[in-house]
């Protein structure tokens, strides 16, 4: 694709190439044959993040605490505010417009990956030899107790939800 009539950081208007406004500024008036493009800084709580010819700046995102949101990074004239979720909650989408409580892993499942502000808890079923007997957003699957190392024997087999029960070895009379 050949280049267009106006260079990078310019735009074509009324048969001439005008300079775009830099990030953080909005367009007030197009250039003319005799004048440069006129730009103005965005106001408080506004931003534009690209070279542009916008006549209005965008409003910074509001991190609504009623939706479980808090400010992760305050917006500038060139960047939007970045929201994240309160502790124990995570974003419902990439845009992080609302939050939901982290999911807990049920008994029989352990935490594979602890939730973050932007991702939910990832659970995994406890494999043979491991168990989880609680509903938790933090607990991994625990290995069954090794009766042998305690000089004990398995009296009750473990499951994915219960540990083995160890007992004393039967003494030969």
């Amino acid at each position: 694709e050949p280049p267009t009539a106006c260079r990078e950081k310019q735009y074509l208007i009324n048969s001439q190439c005008c300079s775009l406004c830099q990030p953080g500024q909005k367009l007030v008036s197009d250039c003319t044959e005799f004048t440069e493009t006129e730009c103005l800084p965005c106001g408080e709580s506004e931003f534009l993040d690209t070279w542009n010819r916008e006549t209005h700046c965008h409003q910074h995102k509001y991190c609504d605490p009623n939706l479980g949101l808090r400010v992760q990074q305050k917006g500038t004239s060139e960047t939007d505010t970045i929201c994240t979720c309160e502790e124990g909650w995570h974003c419902t989408s990439e845009a992080c417009e609302s939050c939901v409580l982290h999911r807990s892993c049920s008994p029989g499942f352990g935490v594979k990956q602890i939730a973050t502000g932007v991702s939910d808890t990832i659970c995994e079923p406890c494999p043979v030899g491991f168990f989880s007997n609680v509903s938790s957003a933090f607990e991994k699957c625990h290995p069954w107790t090794s009766c042998e190392t305690k000089d004990l024997v398995v009296q009750q087999a473990g499951t994915n939800k219960t540990d083995v029960v160890c007992g004393p070895q039967d003494r030969l009379r």
């Epitope: 050949p2 280049p3 009539a5 260079r7 074509l12 048969s15």
Partner: antibody
């Protein structure tokens, strides 16, 4: 004073091509865009495309993509429009004009007649 | 594409009369509206750019106004040399488009 001097009348055969020239004077050639316009007999004006003589960047009307090729030669301050695969629909007067807050200065027009 | 409409294709007026030619765009063109005069011999010149800016060398009897989608060219005191066809053109959005023209004749 600013002048846009176009090449003379062309009588050409269908299927051939033609190159119309537009020599600019009286201003800095690379400082302004050059626009091209078509006018069929007794009709209105139709925009073909625009070229930046400074570095050869172009924008075309979709309708003229593949029909018109715009170029410019800085050394001679001349813009060119190459019209290809001519048909009777291409018979028209073609104008070049210097940009800058509208089509500020126009050439006198070049009549292209496509006929057997 | 933006459509430019000059509803009056021809207009007859007397010398000395005030004449207004109108032009409508199919969408807002933010005052990027130019007016051209094409004489019977085919020569074209810019009269007014950006709605109301008089081009150098154009007599002050020509003026332009308008906003949004509706624009007009006014000749305050018609002279013989003003006999021509007048075209409006939008420079807001590619492709640039012209009105169909208004041919001005003397009564």
């Amino acid at each position: 004073q600013v002048q846009m001097l176009q090449s003379g009348t062309e009588l050409v055969r269908p299927g051939t091509s033609v190159k119309v020239s537009c020599k600019a004077s009286g201003y800095g050639f690379t400082n302004y865009l050059i626009e091209w316009v078509k006018q069929r007999p007794g009709q209105g004006l139709e925009w073909i495309g625009v070229i930046n003589p400074g570095y050869g960047g172009v924008n075309y009307n979709e309708k003229f993509k593949g029909k018109a090729i715009l170029t410019a030669d800085k050394s001679s301050s001349t813009a060119y429009m190459h019209l290809t695969s001519l048909t009777s629909d291409d018979s028209a007067v073609y104008f070049c004009a210097r940009g800058g807050s509208g089509f500020a200065f126009w050439g006198q027009g070049t009549l292209v007649t496509v006929s057997t | 594409d933006i459509q430019m409409t000059q509803t009056t294709s021809s207009l007859s007026a007397s010398l000395g009369q005030r004449v207004t030619i109108s032009c409508r765009a199919s969408q807002d063109i933010s005052n990027h509206l130019n007016w051209y005069q094409q004489k019977p011999n085919g020569t074209v010149r810019l009269l007014i750019s950006s709605t109301s800016r008089l081009h150098s060398g154009v007599p002050s009897r020509f003026s332009g106004s308008g906003s949004g989608t509706d624009y007009s060219l006014t000749i305050s005191n018609l002279e013989q040399e003003d006999i021509a066809t007048y075209f409006c053109q939008q420079g807001n959005t590619l492709p640039w488009t012209f009105g169909g023209g208004t041919k001005l004749e003397i009564k």
